[in-house]
Amino acid sequence: MHVAQPAVVLASSRGIASFVCEYASPGKATEVRVTVLRQADSQVTEVCAATYMMGNELTFLDDSICTGTSSGNQVNLTIQGLRAMDTGLYICKVELMYPPPYYLGIGNGTQIYVIDPEPCPDSD
Amino acid sequence: MHVAQPAVVLASSRGIASFVCEYASPGKATEVRVTVLRQADSQVTEVCAATYMMGNELTFLDDSICTGTSSGNQVNLTIQGLRAMDTGLYICKVELMYPPPYYLGIGNGTQIYVIDPEPCPDSD
């Protein structure tokens, strides 16, 4: 299953990055799982994941750094709290969980660049 | 003539970006001209240029946004005063001006990403 996502995204100076993950659904899935993976330093780690029912809200865990909304076959993902050290390739993984058959799609990744802001001068 | 430069550079939150432009000189040039070009929005513009004698300092015009140093076949370039709107592909062009023969080398470009900082809160 084909998954599309932008090649590059710049995090804002507040450490927030948003991108769209779009999948070409071969069937009429009602339950979809979206996972964001980060690849950096020869390592792949799970950033966040959410399972949602088509037409419903996308819900991540309370302590997740991700938020998102879904619209049809598009998922709008936002990752917050990013620091320069979090720069890396963020890969969108989409699984159509129900009904069968199960489908898996993995995007090419979005390179997210993060620049730490200069600290503001102390107010006297 | 082959010219090497990094693929991507992030400007600091102060709007400063530095990168190395290295050329494989086919001869013993004594006079070298380095030009930084920016390609964005279907347009190529000259950002800055400097001609230097090998072994001497690299001198840009006083009002230039570029500074640089040279060491052998390497030129260390710094561009300052960058804003988000200056994001683009910065291409290093090297010309061996003297003695003949003339040689031209053009790098593949360095994508410089610039993020405008959040303004600091007013101090009361």
């Epitope: - | 003539m1 279907s42 190529v44 513009t45 053009i106 470009g109």
Partner: nanobody
Framework: QVQLQESGGGSVQAGGTLRLSCAVS????????MGWFRQAPGKEREGVAA????????AYADSVKGRFTISQDNAKNTVYLQMNSLKPEDTAMYYC??????????????????????WGQGTQVTVSS
């Protein structure tokens, strides 16, 4: 040393044709990109057409699409610009330049000439109405 020599310019009436040639010598690097540029008095040099010798892909300025054709003869080390349906606004000095294949498509951008070099002396094209 890379040297480029243009020829084939001249004076023609509007609607006429010309074929410009650029003889290339001393090119030791391959692949490369060859471009045709023009410069009218008091104006910036602008890219007209470019061709990549590694695969024959071409790029044209919007103002000449469908009228001009760039081609090359690798055996003769020559690049041509066939100019048909010439207009008075095509009047300019025409130059060929060599550049990096990565920026072949950039030749026709505003300021694209900055990415080329090894300029020849040029050949004058004058189109009268």
């Amino acid at each position: 040393q890379v040297q480029l020599q243009e020829s084939g310019g001249g004076s023609v009436q509007a609607g006429g044709t010309l074929r410009l040639s650029c003889a290339v010598s001393g090119v030791t690097y391959s692949p490369h990109c060859m471009g045709w540029f023009r410069q009218a008095p008091g104006k910036e040099r602008e890219g007209v057409a470019a061709i990549y010798n590694g695969g024959g892909s071409t790029a044209y300025a919007d103002s000449v699409k469908g009228r001009f054709t760039i081609s090359q003869d690798n055996a003769k080390n020559t690049v041509y610009l066939q100019m048909n349906s010439l207009k008075p606004e095509d009047t300019a000095m025409y130059y060929c330049g060599a550049g990096s294949p990565r920026f072949c498509a950039s030749a026709t951008m505003t300021g694209g000439h900055h990415l080329f070099g090894y300029w020849g002396q040029g050949t004058q094209v004058t189109v009268s109405s």
